[in-house]
Amino acid sequence: MADGSSDAAREPRPAPAPIRRRSSNYRAYATEPHAKKKSKISASRKLQLKTLLLQIAKQELEREAEERRGEKGRALSTRCQPLELAGLGFAELQDLCRQLHARVDKVDEERYDIEAKVTKNITEIADLTQKIFDLRGKFKRPTLRRVRISADAMMQALLGARAKESLDLRAHLKQVKKEDTEKENREVGDWRKNIDALSGMEGRKKKFES
């Protein structure tokens, strides 16, 4: 297979792509032009990075959830004292229930007042937002395009300043030499066009229909 790819690199016109229906074949076909000069990140490496990023994201989410739980616990411990029942009997517990019910009623009143204020604020915000739209005139939001993000950028976004300290991904990657010829670059470009044409539902549809 490697020999075939080197022959193809020497010929002026690349051979037409064979009709393949299995995704594993597509993968093999996609890697063929790079048998000699490997892509910057291999598929397995990409998968490894994705897995790593997902793990980091998962850890971050778990840490945040843990922090929230801790915060809730701290808030509750300051608001709710532990029940001290030693030496207290039926009479005191009955009275304690009365005291706690009174406290609950008070908190409920406060919550109701706060909710009323929040509702009022939300209404005011909605009114002001509407006024802003009216003043600006109607406008259309630009359609958002998908942006390709490098592994480094993704790590930077996830970890912020810690990205460089925790993992220097580039250290794990093979450096690509810059001695590529124009011809090779052009062929690589053609190959990429082929893959782009095949990617997406339309490309797959054409491939399967042929």
Partner: antibody, heavy 121, light 107 residues
Framework: EVQMVESGGGLLKPGGSLKLSCAAS????????MSWVRQTPEKRLEWVAT????????YYPDSVKGRFTISRDNAKNTLYLQMLSLRSEDTAMYYC??????????????WGQGSSVTVSS | DIQMTQTSSSLSASLGDRVTISCRAS??????LNWYQQKPDGTIKLLIY???RIHSGVSSRFSGSGSGTDYSLTISNLEQEDIATYFC????????TFDTGTKLELK
């Protein structure tokens, strides 16, 4: 031996304030609720206040609510009763007592010797 | 508030007698009743709790009984050291209340 010693009593005028103390010993103080009970000159016993073991909850009869405050210092094994706006009817012997309970029935199982408070103009 | 009342404020008895002191609550207190003894020097001791349970260190000559609203303290074979004032106290509802006491005297 379980022991309670009250102090801080005295003679004062109506409207005055006073703070009684009760030093407890012979038991794990922080494990028990505590109470103050007074005995009037007519020898009637009146419950005045109760505080939970950790000091979070306190209980009072209407006659002293808002004027008296029970508190405790578990590090010092000491119980306190802060009395404000004293009236002549507050004249009594004030006893400090340890609380315990059995199947919901609470009782004062050990009492101090008492501290005398006289409110008179 | 629950009112506690004793049938008599004082009682005379002879040494060796069996003495019964009664106490009534103004409403049901479901056995949440305690008995205290106050000696002439002012010291107060718990005798009986939860109607019939004898407190540690208290002589078995003391016993308690009752239910609902009516309760009693019995001293069998009265001794000199039993000469004191006896109080009942309900532990059912706050405020905790005592009766006026029954003073036990020798005949």
């Amino acid at each position: 031996e379980v022991q309670m010693v009250e102090s801080g009593g005295g003679l004062l005028k109506p409207g005055g304030s006073l703070k009684l103390s009760c030093a407890a010993s012979g038991f794990t103080y922080s494990n028990y609720a505590m109470s103050w009970v007074r005995q009037t000159p007519e020898k009637r016993l009146e419950w005045v206040a109760t505080i939970s073991s950790g000091g979070s909850y306190s209980y009072y009869p209407d006659s002293v609510k808002g004027r008296f405050t029970i508190s405790r210092d578990n590090a010092k094994n000491t119980l306190y009763l802060q009395m404000l706006s004293l009236r002549s009817e507050d004249t009594a012997m004030y006893y400090c007592a340890r609380r315990d309970n059995y199947f919901g029935s609470s009782f004062m199982d050990y009492w101090g010797q008492g501290s005398s408070v006289t409110v008179s103009s | 508030d629950i009112q506690m009342t004793q049938t008599s404020s004082s009682l005379s008895a002879s040494l060796g007698d069996r003495v019964t002191i009664s106490c009534r609550a103004s409403q049901e207190i479901t056995n949440y009743l305690n008995w205290y003894q106050q000696k002439p020097d002012g010291t107060i001791k718990l005798l009986i709790y939860y109607t019939s349970r004898i407190h540690s260190g208290v002589s078995s000559r003391f016993s308690g009984s009752g239910s609902g609203t009516d309760y009693s303290l019995t001293i069998s074979n009265l001794e000199q050291e039993d000469i004191a004032t006896y109080f009942c106290q309900q532990g059912h509802t706050i405020p905790l209340t005592f009766d006026t006491g029954t003073k036990l005297e020798l005949k």
